[in-house]
């Protein structure tokens, strides 16, 4: 049996990486009322380069129509880009009160899985 | 800063699980000749339960169309259900040859990432 | 909409005074600070100075080509903040634009107005 | 204060080659450092946040990396619409600074 399979690789040209986006805080669905925006880093691109021996026959099979998956839950055929650490995001609130979400934005990514 | 994120959650009622089925070698993609059939498992289903502060507000951003991901790679918003050990898989080939392939199907799952 | 309007620019003489004004709309930027950035005609870009938000209680800093001559403030209830520039001299004549840096573990010039043109000459 | 400087300060290059920009601290700005292009008569846009994080609606063409003293904007495949001024700035320590800029022209 293989390892856990689970260790960050190294994103590189990829397209997996770290991405910012100035978003209303209200937009973030956390109930706080605010008209402030905060500074979102998420996680985005692909993964294709890290894939398994698992991965290219999933994708094999996927692409002949030789698998039946599930009904809304298609198998993910490479690991995901996904964060790998996390900070917290202040703002002020309608009532100029200081908030401090905490791991609400990504700070680092990698193909996990 | 959070940590890795990465380690596996217990998948559960979640959806994410192992799920198996027999495929002819053939579409598994190796390149080899045989017309043998061979079971593999593979992980899929949700994991919607495992996720972060960060993840509710990226689907939050993406719901309300307050976020622009870039062309083809949307961000996934969810730990997503990957393998988490392998096995080989043995086959024989036309030639009556047995093949084995390492780390082709899946004996875990979990929530990664 | 999000966008940052700068007004107030204008010819004025050496020793002379001027206020720059900076209306945000779109957002509130009272969690956030309000920077101004220079620049003269074909040269780079000058950091002039900051007022941070009301959790740093306001404090200022400004850039040492400017101190003691240039003076920043807000009114958040207006989402407007203001630069006040005494004692102006030839040197000071740029583009000058106001900048909103939000709350961040790195901050970045997030949101620029579109500049207004401070010219002094005699 | 802090110093940074650009490298070049001028560059001319054609359609569809990687450009790459040097940026230099005076001293260690771990990734506080953020790059912008400036298009004639417009404000700077930031491109690149905390030395490498692209910034939404940027094309993934642009690339930033580096830490401490020594930063590098890439351009992996450059386009038309390039052909602008980029400079870098820092955040580290009050006064925030930019680098003197570097002119990408068509050549």
């Known amino acids: 049996a293989g390892g856990p399979g689970s260790r960050p690789r190294a994103a590189g040209a990829r397209g997996c990486r770290l991405r910012s986006q100035l978003v209303p805080v209200r937009a973030l669905g956390l109930g706080h009322r605010s008209d402030e925006l905060v500074r979102f880093r998420f996680c985005s691109g692909s993964c294709r380069r890290a894939r398994s021996p698992h991965d290219l026959s999933l994708a094999s099979l996927l692409g002949a129509g030789a698998l039946r998956p599930p009904p809304g839950s298609r198998p993910i055929s490479q690991p995901c880009c996904r964060p790998t650490r996390y900070e917290a995001v202040s703002f002020m609130d309608v009532n100029s009160t200081w908030r401090t979400v905490d791991r609400l934005s990504a700070t680092a990514c990698g193909c996990l899985g | 800063a959070g940590g890795p994120g990465s380690r596996p959650r217990a998948a559960g009622a979640r959806g994410c699980r192992l799920r198996s089925q027999l495929v002819p070698v053939r579409a598994l993609g190796l390149g080899h000749r045989s017309d043998e059939l061979v079971r593999f498992r593979f992980c899929s289903g949700s994991c919607r339960r495992a996720r972060s502060p960060h993840d509710l507000s990226l689907a939050s951003l993406l719901g309300a169309g307050a976020l622009r991901p870039p062309p083809g790679s949307r961000p996934i918003s969810q730990p997503c259900c990957r393998p988490t050990r392998y096995e080989a898989v043995s086959f024989m080939d036309v030639n009556s040859t047995w093949r084995t392939v390492d780390r082709l199907s899946a004996t875990a799952c979990g929530c990664l990432g | 909409e999000v966008q940052l309007v700068e007004s107030g620019g204008d010819l004025v003489q050496p020793g002379g005074s001027l206020k720059l004004s900076c209306a945000a709309s779109g957002f509130t930027f009272s969690g956030s600070a309000m920077h101004w950035v220079r620049q003269a005609s074909g040269k780079g870009l000058e950091w002039v100075g900051r007022?941070?938000?009301?959790?740093?209680?306001?404090?200022?800093e400004y850039g040492a080509s400017v101190k003691g001559r240039f003076t920043i403030s807000r009114d958040d209830s207006k989402n407007t903040a203001y630069l006040q520039m005494n004692s102006l001299k030839i040197e000071d004549t740029a583009v000058y634009y106001c900048?909103?840096?939000?709350?961040?573990?790195?901050?970045?010039?997030?949101?620029w107005g579109q500049g207004t043109m401070v010219t002094v000459s005699s | 204060d802090i110093q940074m400087t650009q490298s070049p300060s001028s560059l001319s290059a054609s359609v569809g080659d990687r450009v790459t920009i040097t940026c230099r601290a005076s001293q260690s700005i771990s990734t506080y450092l953020n790059w912008y292009q400036q298009k004639p008569g417009k404000a700077p846009n930031l491109l690149i946040y905390?030395?490498?994080t692209l910034e939404s609606g940027v094309p993934s063409r642009f690339s930033g990396s580096g830490s401490g003293t020594d930063f590098t904007l890439t351009i992996s495949s450059l386009q038309p619409e390039d052909f602008e001024i980029y400079y870098c700035?820092?955040?580290?320590?009050?006064?925030?600074?930019f680098g003197q800029g570097t002119k990408v022209e068509i050549k």
């Open positions: 905390a030395a490498s």
């Open positions: 007022i941070r938000n009301k959790v740093h209680r306001y404090a200022t």
């Open positions: 700035q820092q955040s580290y320590n009050i006064p925030w600074t």
């Open positions: 900048v909103v840096v939000v709350p961040g573990s790195i901050e970045a010039f997030d949101i």
